[in-house]
Interface confidence: low
């Protein structure tokens, strides 16, 4: 029953002597499983007996008996589903029909696959897509109906002979659809690829050449073009022909018309493949090609620089840069239409000729003001000397020059003058704009390049000034010299080191800062009286009567300065010390009686000791010793000592008397 | 347009050598590759050999490989054949041209006698 039997493979497969083939095929057999399998090769139906006449292949059944053919032929298939087949090697009379004799419990079915082997390896095809154009990428495809496990092979592309060097992409399909390798190729090609052999060859697996196919590329692409000029150098002179060709190397497909083009744009009226130029002008040179055209589009040729010769034109003077600064670098370059280029130059500042001078260019490499000036040239080329243009000015600028700041006050100058000065200068390109001073100051300027300085210091000792245009140039600085008093006198001690004792040598100096002039007179003063002119003042041996307020001055030209000032102190023990009593010498007794020691001394005494008749020191140490209730026992004499940090000093003897009061003298 | 003029061609026995040139004009010829070609009486055009635009690779026909030499000197725009170890087979009308192919030259003839 047909209906129940449903085979997938392809309908013919493709072989060639000693390689070998390999039949992908599905099956269905609904009423249960594959028990027999017969390959017949050409199997014939025997009417008479029922069953297929041929060769058989292969063979498998229930006893499992199987022909010597078995390990050419395999039976890769299951009893349900997979009936593919391999035969290897494969030969030529394998060609025709394979049958495929399956029975299953109850039913049988013969399936026919055809099978073309050849004597040698068949050659691949090539595909080539419908058109072909220049720098277009396209995909060459090489297409061989075949496929085996057991024999690999591989496809090479080859141009001219020569392995393409674009990697091709390789795949094989052995599947119950289609059995086939195939290689594609991605690849640009050129216009020179047009008419060249491509070749896709077969080989084995070790890359022994098995048969190929070649095809020609039919590239379309524009033309492509020669360019030929008479005379062949393109250099010719005013009023000289020129003729131009154009040749078509290659067009693909035929060119449709031709054109001329100078400097990239249309010639009128000159549609051949010749361009005849006669009698050229200066205005004819440039470059020309010539444009042919196809269906593909425009091809061009290479540009043909066409050069027409004519004296140099009158000259231009092109200056870098001006206006110059000075020091600077400076070119000059000659600007003439000339061809050929000029040769030789001539050039001239101010109308006269420079000698040495024959380029294209002049350069001063450190610019001086006198080059300033008007700068032409002349240019010579082989056909004549060009005629001299209206030249260029060359601006030379530079700081102002030879710059002085000028006093305008009567010397000397005296502190607290009113100042003057002027900034002076020589030259200056451009003008002078500004001016500036140093050291700065709250100083008025009246007028440019003047300066007025109210109230001159004692130290304002130099003036610079500057004259400024785009630049500033500074002045030497000029020395005011200020004249002035003499200036911070003081008093200062030179001996002794420490402080002063009475008896000791005492040297003062009288010290000042400055002076202006430096000749100057001194004098020492003491409570307004005069005591000395020089710079010191001396004492062999101080007495504290020396102590006081001493003040020194210092005259020059100018004025007198005094120090501050300066206390004179002297140290002595104490002196003229005495006793004396309140409220008298002589005190009733009963009353109060207050005895004080009183001294000369510096410092002032520190500590004081009392002393009775008897010279016994009484126990009281303060100046002033109270006797209360005075007793008539306390009659007598009584003296003092006072110390301090210098030494110490005593008071002579003074008598204190106690009187008897009238209630004692009224007892007895 | 472009000419190509072969000559070198002659009568030669069987194990002789002869050569062959092939002089191009037009400028371009140093960018085409040349190959050389021959046409036995009643027989199609075949290509013997082929040589790359600078001369640094060539290729032959298998019937011809070991005995045939191409070789170019561009310039003076001229491709060679060089033929040794001539047979009677290789008797022909040979042609030049570029590829892809210029106007046909008029060929020059070569004659193997055994």
């Known amino acids: 029953d047909s209906s129940k039997w449903v085979f997938e493979h392809p309908e013919t497969l493709y072989a060639w002597e000693g390689a070998c083939v390999w039949i992908p095929c599905t099956y269905r057999a609904l009423d249960g499983d594959l028990e027999s399998f017969i390959l017949f090769h050409n199997p014939e139906y025997n009417k008479n007996t029922s069953k297929f006449d041929g060769t058989r292949l292969y063979e498998s059944t229930k006893d499992g008996k199987v022909p010597s053919e078995q390990k050419r032929v395999q039976f890769l298939g299951d009893k349900n589903k997979n009936c593919t087949l391999s035969i290897h090697p494969v030969h030529l009379n394998d060609s025709g029909q394979l049958g495929l004799r399956m029975e299953s419990k109850t039913e049988k079915w013969m399936e026919r696959i055809h099978l073309n082997v050849s004597e040698r390896p068949f050659p691949p095809h090539i595909q080539l897509p419908p058109e072909i154009q220049e720098s277009q990428e396209v995909t060459l495809t090489c297409l061989l109906n075949f496929s085996c496990y057991g024999y690999p092979i591989q496809l090479q592309w080859l141009l001219e002979g020569v392995p393409m060097r674009q990697a091709a992409v390789t795949s094989t399909s052995l599947t119950i659809k289609s059995v086939f390798t195939r290689s594609e190729l991605k690849f640009s090609p050129q216009w020179s690829h047009h008419g060249k052999i491509v070749t896709c060859q077969l080989q084995d697996a070790d890359g022994k050449f098995l048969s190929n196919d070649t095809v020609q590329l039919n590239v379309k692409h524009t033309p492509k073009l020669e360019i030929k000029v008479t005379p062949s150098d393109a250099i010719v002179r005013e009023g000289d022909s020129v003729t131009m060709t154009c040749e078509v190397s290659s067009s693909n497909p035929e060119y449709t018309t031709v054109s001329w083009l100078k400097d990239g744009t249309s010639l009128k009226k000159q549609n051949t493949f010749t361009l005849n130029l006669r009698e050229v002008t200066k205005d004819q040179s440039g470059k020309y090609c010539c444009q042919v055209s196809n269906d593909v589009g425009p091809g061009r040729s290479e540009e043909v620089f066409l050069q027409v010769q004519y004296a140099p034109e009158p000259s231009t003077v092109q200056i870098l840069h001006s206006p110059a600064v000075e020091g600077s670098q400076v070119e000059f370059l000659c600007m003439s239409l000339a061809n050929p280029l000029p040769t030789n130059y001539t050039w001239y500042h101010n109308g006269k000729e420079m000698q040495g001078r024959t380029e294209e260019k002049v350069h001063i490499p450190k610019i001086l003001p006198w080059h300033a000036g008007t700068y032409s040239c002349v240019a010579e080329n082989i056909l004549g000397t060009g005629q001299r243009g209206p030249g260029a000015e060359l601006d030379v600028q530079y700081p102002p020059k030879k710059v002085t700041t000028v006093i305008q006050n009567p010397m000397p100058i005296r502190e607290g003058d009113t100042v003057t000065l002027s900034c002076n200068y020589n030259s200056s390109n451009p003008s002078v704009t500004r001016y500036e001073w140093k050291p700065h100051g709250a100083w008025e300027e009246p007028s440019l390049g003047v300066l007025k300085i109210q109230n001159v210091g004692w130290d304002n000792t130099t003036i610079a000034c500057a004259a400024c245009n785009s630049w500033c140039s500074w002045a030497s600085p000029v020395a005011l010299n200020v004249q002035y008093a003499p200036r911070d006198v003081r008093v200062r001690k030179i001996k002794p080191l420490s402080e002063i004792h009475s008896g000791n040598s005492v040297s003062l100096q009288c010290d000042f800062s400055s002076s202006h002039p430096k000749e100057v007179q001194f004098f020492w003063e003491k409570n307004g009286r005069l005591l000395g002119k020089e710079s010191q003042l001396n004492f062999d041996s101080i007495s504290p009567e020396d102590a006081g307020s001493y003040s020194c001055w210092v005259n020059n030209s100018i004025g007198q300065t005094a120090s501050k000032a300066w206390t004179l102190e002297v140290l002595y023990a104490p002196r003229r010390l005495r006793v004396s009593m309140s409220p008298g010498d002589q005190v009733m007794e009963g009353k109060s009686a207050t005895l004080t020691c009183e001294s000369d001394a510096n410092p002032p005494v520190s500590h004081y000791t009392w002393f009775d008749w008897n010279n016994q020191s009484l126990p009281y140490h303060s100046q002033k010793l109270r006797l209360e209730p005075v007793k008539v026992q306390h009659s007598g004499a009584y003296w003092c000592q006072g110390t301090n940090s210098v030494g110490k000093g005593r008071s002579p003897l003074s008598t204190l008397t106690v009187y008897y009061s009238p209630e004692t003298i009224g007892r007895r | 347009q472009v000419q190509l003029v072969e000559s070198g061609g002659g009568l030669v026995q069987a194990g002789g050598s002869l050569r062959l040139s092939c002089a191009a004009s037009?400028?371009?010829?140093?960018?085409?590759?040349m190959a050389w070609y021959r046409q036995a009486p009643g027989k199609q055009r075949e290509r013997v050999g082929v040589?790359?635009?600078?001369?640094?690779?060539?290729t032959d026909a298998a019937s011809v490989q070991g005995r045939f030499t191409i070789s170019r000197d561009n310039a003076k725009n001229t491709v060679y054949l060089q033929m040794n170890s001539l047979k009677p087979e290789d008797t022909a009308v040979y042609y030049c041209?570029?590829?892809?192919?210029?106007?046909w030259g008029q060929g020059t003839q070569v004659t193997v006698s055994s």
């Open positions: 040589i790359n635009s600078d001369g640094s690779y060539t």
């Open positions: 041209n570029t590829m892809p192919p210029w106007p």
């Open positions: 037009g400028s371009t010829f140093s960018l085409k590759a």
